[in-house]
């Protein structure tokens, strides 16, 4: 706004910054065990994986950046059960990966299937 | 681990994933007003900026990825006071940018100067 008062280049820089902060899928580090709700005697190596999760800003304070579509990606991890009775097993672990995001009210009344962060 | 039992390529992929999840400065979207602790009648356009903040996993569950060094970067933003008595002003806003991170205990008893996230 108020474009007439300001240098076009400055406004362009500000606008680019704003675009980059918008609600979108962003690469995030998640802890596998807490993600899967595993008991403390099951753990993974590595304990964390990189996936995309919705994050960023919305135009209104009353809105929250939430996922509207999700895919599940498979990560090869060592699953270790304690007490250790066998060699740690290499297992494919499916982790939610957000593919679409939208700024939504905190208690959405529309039929999106949301997995909250 | 257990390198002898598994295909080297698979282990390499797992190790690379682990390296990418490690505690390090990551580009993050922060809300300027809450970052600066501004009153509700002052807001910024855009409301969010991109800076680097410490994030990721540590080798121990009891450690937290925290910043050990910080720079302050200046972002050009419109500062708007409500009720609007004048034209929105273009101001330089200094925001903390984490430049170094370390996995640290939550209540460090050693003399690190930590700015908690």
């Amino acid at each position: 706004f108020a474009a007439t008062f300001y240098d076009i280049e400055t406004l362009k820089v500000i606008d680019e910054e704003w675009q980059r902060t918008q609600c979108s899928p962003r690469e995030t580090c998640v802890e596998v065990a807490s993600e899967l709700g595993k008991s403390t005697n099951t753990f993974f190596k590595p304990p964390c994986v990189n996936v995309f999760r919705c994050g960023g800003c919305c135009n209104e304070e009353s809105l929250i950046c939430m996922n509207t579509s999700t895919s599940y990606i498979s990560k090869q991890l060592f699953e270790i059960s304690v007490p250790l009775t066998s060699v740690p097993e290499l297992v494919p672990v499916k982790v939610a990966n957000h593919t679409g995001c939208k700024c939504l009210p905190t208690a959405p009344r529309h039929p999106y299937s949301i997995i909250r962060r | 681990f257990a390198a002898t039992f598994y295909d080297i390529e698979t282990l390499k992929v797992i190790d690379e994933e682990w390296q990418r999840t490690q505690c390090s400065p990551r580009e993050t979207c922060v809300e300027v007003a809450s970052e600066l602790g501004k009153s509700t009648n002052t807001f910024f356009k855009p409301p969010c900026v991109n800076v680097f903040r410490c994030g990721g996993c540590c080798n121990e569950e009891s450690l937290i990825c925290m910043n050990t060094s910080t720079s302050y970067i200046s972002k050009q933003l419109f500062e708007i006071s409500v009720p609007l008595t004048s034209v929105p002003e273009l101001v330089p806003v200094k925001v903390a940018n984490h430049t170094g991170c370390k996995c640290l205990p939550t209540a460090p008893r050693h003399p690190y100067s930590i700015i908690r996230r």
Partner: antibody
Framework: QVQLVQSGAEVKQPGASVKVSCKAS????????MYWVRQAPGQGLGWMGY????????TYNQKFKGRVTMTTDTSTSTAYMELRSLRSDDTAVYYC???????????WGRGTLVTVAS | DIVMTQTPLSSPVTLGQPASISCRSS???????????LHWLQQRPGQPPRLLIY???NRFSGVPDRFSGSGAGTDFTLKISRVEAEDMGVYYC?????????FGQGTKLEIK
Amino acid sequence: QVQLVQSGAEVKQPGASVKVSCKASGYTFTGYNMYWVRQAPGQGLGWMGYIDPYNGDTTYNQKFKGRVTMTTDTSTSTAYMELRSLRSDDTAVYYCARTSYYGGMDYWGRGTLVTVAS
Amino acid sequence: DIVMTQTPLSSPVTLGQPASISCRSSQSLVHSNGNTYLHWLQQRPGQPPRLLIYKVSNRFSGVPDRFSGSGAGTDFTLKISRVEAEDMGVYYCSQSTHVPRTFGQGTKLEIK
């Protein structure tokens, strides 16, 4: 299987330095913190500090601050602990111990006896 | 530093009978993430310590089920349901919630 092989016993004079090595095998070296613990003859266990082999970050017990340095060589999966300005009360068995993600020291080296005597 | 106090310091036991070791910390060992990082180690004569129990009650790999851990906050217990000859040695509690990591002074388990 996980193994931590430590260097041999050392006899040092007061004021000297000692560097103990701990070669790890059977796991991804950079994925676990390495702790160093010492035990004086007939005494209990004392924690010296740890190193994160991924990036070389260290956290030391204040008791040893300025006298201890922990390092790693990721190419050989070896951790090192150097203790300087040795005194007679530094005579102890020095252990390296791998720490699991959940905080327990799950695998230990067999220990290196360091004797400080003039 | 967190002080870990073990009782008793020496415990003469009869083979086949139960044994119990107590460990009390000078501050709560509950981490800000809700977990409690209290562990138990066993050290047999001439051997390095060996992890028995991690995070209060989780038995480590290869540890017999006669060993169990319990407790919360500042008070913790290691129990051996039926003591065997191979259980003789010194038992240590340790905490990794706070820095510096600290150990109890040890409890010597010996045959009566």
